[in-house]
């Protein structure tokens, strides 16, 4: 058993049918010695008397808010949460496996640049009685500071019969140098509590591996005289690291017909312009990627050909 | 013509071209190592990230773009940097800093070259003959060193008398390739920046 925060405790249980559970001793936070009784949650049934209460915690029915009283007055509370270990592996009931980029990906994180700022998000089908708390650091043995905000509900969507809820959090490394070569990964730890169930999720990454630039901005077409060709031009996104000659991007320019089945023409360039043939009803899209370290491509920025 | 150390402009293109080749070569070699050594811990998540140049060279610091010298996090533990003189850089200081930067890159390349050659000698003794260093990558390191045109005493290749532990050597190869790829990215960024300056 360990303390999650003041008066909230997590009991770790080897979770299998007929498991013996864990013996837990609760102590009433009071100078009083006599006439103390204990109850669980809203029930008035007295579970025991005395300054300490010994309980065998086996299932969720044994978890909850234990309260010690004296003469009708509440002395203190202890909330017991359960953390299930199923055959050597901590349970992951609360969050959805996003399966991207690989199985057992519960937290996904992205950074728009090398400033040390990043966003993580996760999915759940649970809508109520749910709380998250997020901590982060650079490295784990001698951790360096990363500050995270509060996790917020960022999207809701319907998936088949189920509603899916997306939560996200923004974090910032306290002293980040964009040009630094990372040797210690960023660690992100999310504590999730649903009703009386506690779970924790972790992700470990280098900022360089989670880079996803914003789409190029100011995408414009300039028709070339006496030609079906157009000059496409764009600019680096405002959120990208500077100077751009050091933090260079490479670009992919795509001409896409109205029908998804039509052949796509693609050009790759390090410049911020390209000459392409603009077909009728087609659209031109441009996306960006770090020129030297192949992390994710940005989303597409698009303009119609007409 | 080889790069006269102090002047960034006309001769920078060959260095930029060579540094791009270097990044391509080390990335290909790393990919090959990860595929060939699939039963070894060779992914970025599994290896310890060690930098063999740590405390010996200071490429990131010496080659820091001027625009980042205002960022205090980039100035920690820095003996050398593009120190601003008022609002602009004195040209002699620029030349001096650039020389420091390029010589630091040269020293990096020399250290990695020695490590890779030593390692290749060990890998050639492996009865499994599972993996060897790409000769193209070694050649590209050499070409960039020549383009940088520094004279420095040759470091003797490390020779080891004890029987090599091939498992450890292959893991060391992965660690080395990951670190060298990150350094090659930095070198590419620096060359691109100097080329644009």
């Amino acid at each position: 058993i360990w303390e999650l925060k003041k008066d909230v405790y997590v009991v770790e249980l080897d979770w299998y049918p007929d498991a013996p559970g864990e013996m837990v001793v609760l102590t009433c936070d009071t100078p009083e010695e006599d006439g103390i009784t204990w109850t669980l949650d809203q029930s008035s049934e007295v579970l025991g008397s005395g300054k300490t209460l010994t309980i065998q915690v086996k299932e969720f029915g044994d978890a909850g808010q234990y309260t010690c009283h004296k003469g009708g007055e509440v002395l203190s509370h202890s909330l017991l949460l359960l953390h299930k270990k199923e055959d050597g592996i901590w349970s992951t009931d609360i969050l959805k496996d996003q399966k991207e980029p690989k199985n057992k990906t519960f937290l996904r994180c992205e950074a728009k640049n090398y400033s040390g700022r990043f966003t993580c998000w996760w999915l759940t089908t649970i809508s109520t009685d749910l709380t998250f708390s997020v901590k982060s650091s650079r490295g784990s043995s001698d951790p360096q500071g990363v500050t995270c905000g509060a996790a917020t509900l960022s999207a809701e969507r319907v998936r088949g019969d189920n509603k899916e809820y997306e939560y996200s959090v923004e974090c910032q490394e306290d002293s980040a140098c964009p040009a630094a070569e990372e040797s210690l990964p960023i660690e992100v730890m999310v504590d999730a509590v649903h009703k009386l169930k506690y779970e924790n999720y972790t992700s470990s990454f280098f900022i360089r591996d989670i880079i996803k630039p914003d789409p190029p901005k100011n995408l414009q077409l300039k028709p070339l005289k006496n030609s079906r060709q157009v000059e496409v031009s764009w600019e680096y996104p405002d959120t990208w690291s500077t100077p751009h000659s050091y933090f260079s991007l490479t670009f992919c320019v795509q001409v896409q017909g109205k029908s998804k089945r039509e052949k796509k023409d693609r050009v790759f360039t390090d410049k911020t312009s390209a000459t392409v043939i603009c077909r009728k009803n087609a659209s031109i899209s441009v996306r960006a990627q770090d020129r030297y370290y192949s992390s994710s491509w940005s989303e597409w920025a698009s303009v119609p050909c007409s | 013509r080889n790069l006269p150390v102090a002047t960034p402009d006309p001769g920078m293109f060959p260095c930029l071209h060579h540094s791009q080749n270097l990044l391509r070569a080390v990335s290909n070699m790393l990919q090959k190592a990860r595929q060939t050594l699939e039963f070894y811990p060779c992914t970025s998540e599994e290896i310890d990230h060690e930098d063999i140049t740590k405390d010996k060279t200071s490429t990131v610091e010496a080659c820091l773009p001027l625009e980042l010298t205002k960022n205090e996090s980039c100035l920690n533990s820095r003996e050398t940097s593009f120190i601003t003189n008022g609002s602009c850089l004195a040209s002699r200081k620029t030349s001096f800093m650039m020389a420091l930067c390029l010589s630091s890159i040269y020293e990096d390349l020399k250290m990695y070259q020695v490590e890779f050659k030593t390692m290749n000698a060990k890998l050639l003794m492996d009865p499994k003959r599972q993996i060897f260093l790409d000769q193209n990558m070694l050649a590209v390191i050499d070409e960039l060193m020549q383009a940088l045109n520094f004279n420095s005493e040759t470091v003797p290749q490390k020779s080891s008398l004890e029987e090599p532990d091939f498992y450890k050597t292959k893991i060391k190869l992965c660690i080395l390739l990951h670190a060298f790829r990150i350094r090659a990215v930095t070198i590419d960024r620096v060359m691109s920046y100097l080329n644009a300056s």
């Epitope: 049918p17 498991a19 199923e86 055959d87 050597g88 | -």
Partner: antibody, heavy 115, light 112 residues
Framework: QVQLVQSGGGVVQPGRSLRLSCAAS????????MHWVRQAPGKGLEWVAF????????YYADSVKGRFTISRDNSKNTLYLQMKSLRAEDTAVYYC????????WGQGTMVTVSS | SYVLTQPPSVSGTPGQRVTISCSGG????????VKWYQQLPGTAPKLLIY???QRPSGVPDRFSGSKSGTSASLAITGVQAEDEADYYC????????????FGTGTKVTVLG
């Protein structure tokens, strides 16, 4: 006393369907994940499927994906395996088992797919 | 396709020490716990070892398990006639959990 009692096995022709049941008692069935495991005659153990305690997630072996469906009725304390498009290679003893460091197995039920 | 490899058979005379190996990889045994089962002919498997080296109550102490790196082993010290059975190791793969990964199985024969 934890008990898993299986039923529903038998002889079936290729291409036909069969549903296996596993009735649980002696524990809070709705709190635990459950597996199906099979063993072809003279062969080793092969995992077939898993279902979470609340039925929210189901996992299948590639060999049965799209043909077998694992389900549970927590109000009846029963686990099911619906098998469709059966093949000769599905012939095996099928076991249900609880998920956890200590596990309990059903007695097994024989499924024979033969024309 | 079995990813956990066991020897097809091992044998010993009563009182001898018999060991069965179970070889896997970094993503299974290397990152997860191992169980061992005993299966007597015509019966369901019985748990012998859980969490690499733990014995459930009721399992004789002549059975012991261990794990090192990407391999595990089961030892029977002082093998007895009633130990003649099939033995299976089981683990998980970190990418496919909760799918059970079984070993190929080992037939233990007690001679004489």
């Amino acid at each position: 006393q934890v008990q898993l009692v299986q039923s529903g096995g038998g002889v079936v022709q290729p291409g036909r369907s069969l549903r296996l049941s596993c009735a649980a008692s002696g524990f809070t069935f709705s709190s635990y994940g459950m597996h199906w495991v099979r063993q072809a005659p003279g062969k080793g153990l092969e995992w077939v499927a898993f279902i979470r305690y609340d039925g929210s997630n189901k996992y299948y072996a590639d060999s049965v994906k799209g043909r077998f469906t694992i389900s549970r009725d927590n109000s009846k304390n029963t686990l099911y395996l619906q098998m469709k498009s059966l093949r000769a290679e599905d012939t095996a003893v099928y076991y249900c088992k609880t998920h956890g460091s200590h596990d309990n197995w059903g007695q097994g039920t024989m499924v024979t797919v033969s024309s | 396709s079995y990813v956990l490899t066991q020897p097809p058979s091992v044998s010993g005379t009563p009182g001898q020490r018999v060991t069965i190996s179970c070889s896997g990889g970094r993503s299974n045994i290397g990152s997860n716990t191992v169980k061992w089962y005993q299966q007597l002919p015509g019966t369901a498997p019985k748990l012998l070892i859980y969490t690499n080296d733990q014995r459930p109550s009721g399992v004789p102490d002549r059975f012991s398990g261990s794990k090192s790196g990407t391999s595990a082993s089961l030892a029977i010290t002082g093998v007895q006639a009633e130990d003649e059975a099939d033995y299976y190791c089981q683990s998980y793969d970190r990418g496919t959990h909760p799918a059970l990964l079984f070993g190929t199985g080992t037939k233990v024969t007690v001679l004489g």
